[in-house]
Structure formats: C-alpha cells, structure tokens
Interface confidence: low
C-alpha cells in the first residue's frame, strides 16, 4: 500500500514494504527511522 | 487560517536548559505531526526533531539526542521543545512545522515565524 | 542520510529575467509508490521560510506560476520564468523520500 507521511504512524508501521522490521518485547518498530522504544 | 506562534527562546549559558513554545491555531492540531527545524545565524535549514500527531513516537538528528526532548499538548494546541545541556552550536532561530496529513513527504507546509535561542557565556 | 546539493551559491539575476537553481541527491528521491518526494522553499529576508513547491513540480496554493519545478531522480531544478523583486531571498531544496529529512544548502537570488 502507498503510505501517508511519516506521521500516519499505523502507515508506517504496517505499510512501508521498504522497511526493515525489528521484534522488540512490546511492539514492532521500523527500524531507521529512530531508536526503539524501550 | 493556520498559525503557528513559537516562543521561549532567549540568552542563556552552555549547558543550561530552555523550553520552547509553539501554539497553533487554524486547524486541527491534533491531527498532524509537528517538527521542529532550525536555522543558525548565516547557515541554512536544520531538522532536529519531530512528534507523532498523538504524541506516542518522537525522533531527533544525532546532535541533540538524549539532550532535546519534543513533548505535545494537544487540549492546548501547543508544542513544546525542551532543551537541555546546551552548547554553543545550538544558537539558532527556531521554528515549528507543520507535517502534511495524510500524504506522504508532505512536510512543512506551515511555519511558525521563528524564535532565537543564543548560547553564550 | 541523504546529502542534498545546491547550485549556484548566489544568482544575480536582472528583473524581469529568468532564473535556475540545481538541486541534486546523493540517493535517488524515488520512492517505491512512484512519487518523487521533493520540496522547495523560499525564505525572504527576515522572514521564515515557506513552501512553494512539493513532489517536485506541484505548486503550493497562493505561489505565482512564474514558480516552476522539474526533475527526476536525483536532479532537480527550480525555474523563475522572471524575476520580480519580491523573489529576494534564499532558497532551499528539501528531501522528504528518505528519513530524517534533509535541505540543501541554499541559494541565494538577488537582483543585479
């Protein structure tokens, strides 16, 4: 799917295909676009 | 119409502390990402860092990490940037942006009119 | 991140003259929807800056249509078909394709 801005959070979560994704205990973040939140 | 007014900025030595104020009116603001960019004196644009429009995820440029905190109030129509340990290359006027909703790379569509943050002794 | 690249510096430019500004990346500014996520800004002196153009060649409402943009990849330019004095000041690209987003450097327009 073609994504809002970076802002649209549940888009960036579940949208960007270009993204690497990182498991972490509480939530998947992407990772590059800042630290995950501990 | 969409304003954005910053205020809070002023003289204040390395390695003390300052809390700037962006209020906006003219749309919902709930709704939208807010940045704040940068522009030291005779230097260009300068991102530094960015609030999800429910303020559940903030990020930064390097430079300000773990010193730099964005925080939102949404009941208030208002932005906030704390900045902590300031050093000398953090004089600039700072603004507050818009991000675009809802499309993406639609960033700073609106700018506040700046506020100056010097550090010196 | 992604280096943005303006030239020139400084354009002198007669009124009623055109006027170009190269902006280039150091990544292509494709993303994979397709679009092209490439701003400019004005900022005139003493004020902030404003948007004037967004995904390369769209123009923000209340930009005069002298105000053009063009490009692909990662070369882009800004075009003033003729320069007016209200046109002073400095302008800056922007990349929005890639995080966190990036300016170039600027440049500066002033009438000769």
């Known amino acids: 799917c073609s994504c809002s801005s970076l802002m649209d959070k549940e888009c960036v979560y579940f949208c960007h295909l270009d993204i690497i994704w990182v498991n972490t205990p509480e939530h998947v973040v992407p990772y590059g676009l800042g630290s995950p939140r501990s | 119409q969409v304003q954005l007014v910053e205020s809070g900025g002023g003289v204040v030595q390395p390695g003390r502390s300052l809390r700037l104020s962006c209020a906006a009116s003219g749309f919902t603001f709930g709704s939208y990402g807010m940045h704040w960019v940068r522009q030291a004196p005779g230097k260009g644009l300068e991102w530094v860092a960015v609030i999800w429009y429910d303020g559940s995820d903030e990020y930064y440029t390097d430079s300000v990490k773990g010193r730099f905190t964005v925080s939102r109030d949404n009941s208030k129509y208002t932005l906030y940037l704390q900045m902590n340990s300031l050093r000398a290359d953090d004089t600039a006027v700072y603004y507050c942006?818009?991000?675009?909703?809802?499309?993406?790379?639609?960033?700073?569509?609106?700018w506040g009119q700046g506020t100056l943050v010097t550090v010196s002794s | 991140d992604v280096v943005m690249t303006q030239s020139p510096l400084s354009l002198p430019v007669a009124l009623g003259q055109p006027a170009s500004i190269s902006c280039r990346s150091s990544?292509?500014?494709?993303?994979?929807?397709?679009?092209?996520?490439l701003n400019w800004f004005q900022q005139r002196p003493g004020q902030s800056p404003r948007r004037l153009i967004y995904k390369v060649s769209n123009r923000d409402s209340g930009v005069p249509d002298r105000f053009g943009g063009s490009g692909s990849g990662t070369d882009f330019t800004l075009k003033i078909s003729r320069v007016e004095a209200e046109d002073v000041g400095l302008y800056y690209c922007?990349?929005?394709?890639?995080?966190?987003?990036?300016f170039g450097g600027g440049t500066k327009v002033e009438i000769k």
């Open positions: 922007m990349q929005g394709t890639h995080w966190p987003p990036t």
């Open positions: 990544q292509s500014l494709v993303y994979s929807d397709g679009n092209t996520y």
């Open positions: 942006a818009r991000d675009g909703y809802r499309t993406r790379g639609n960033y700073f569509d609106y």
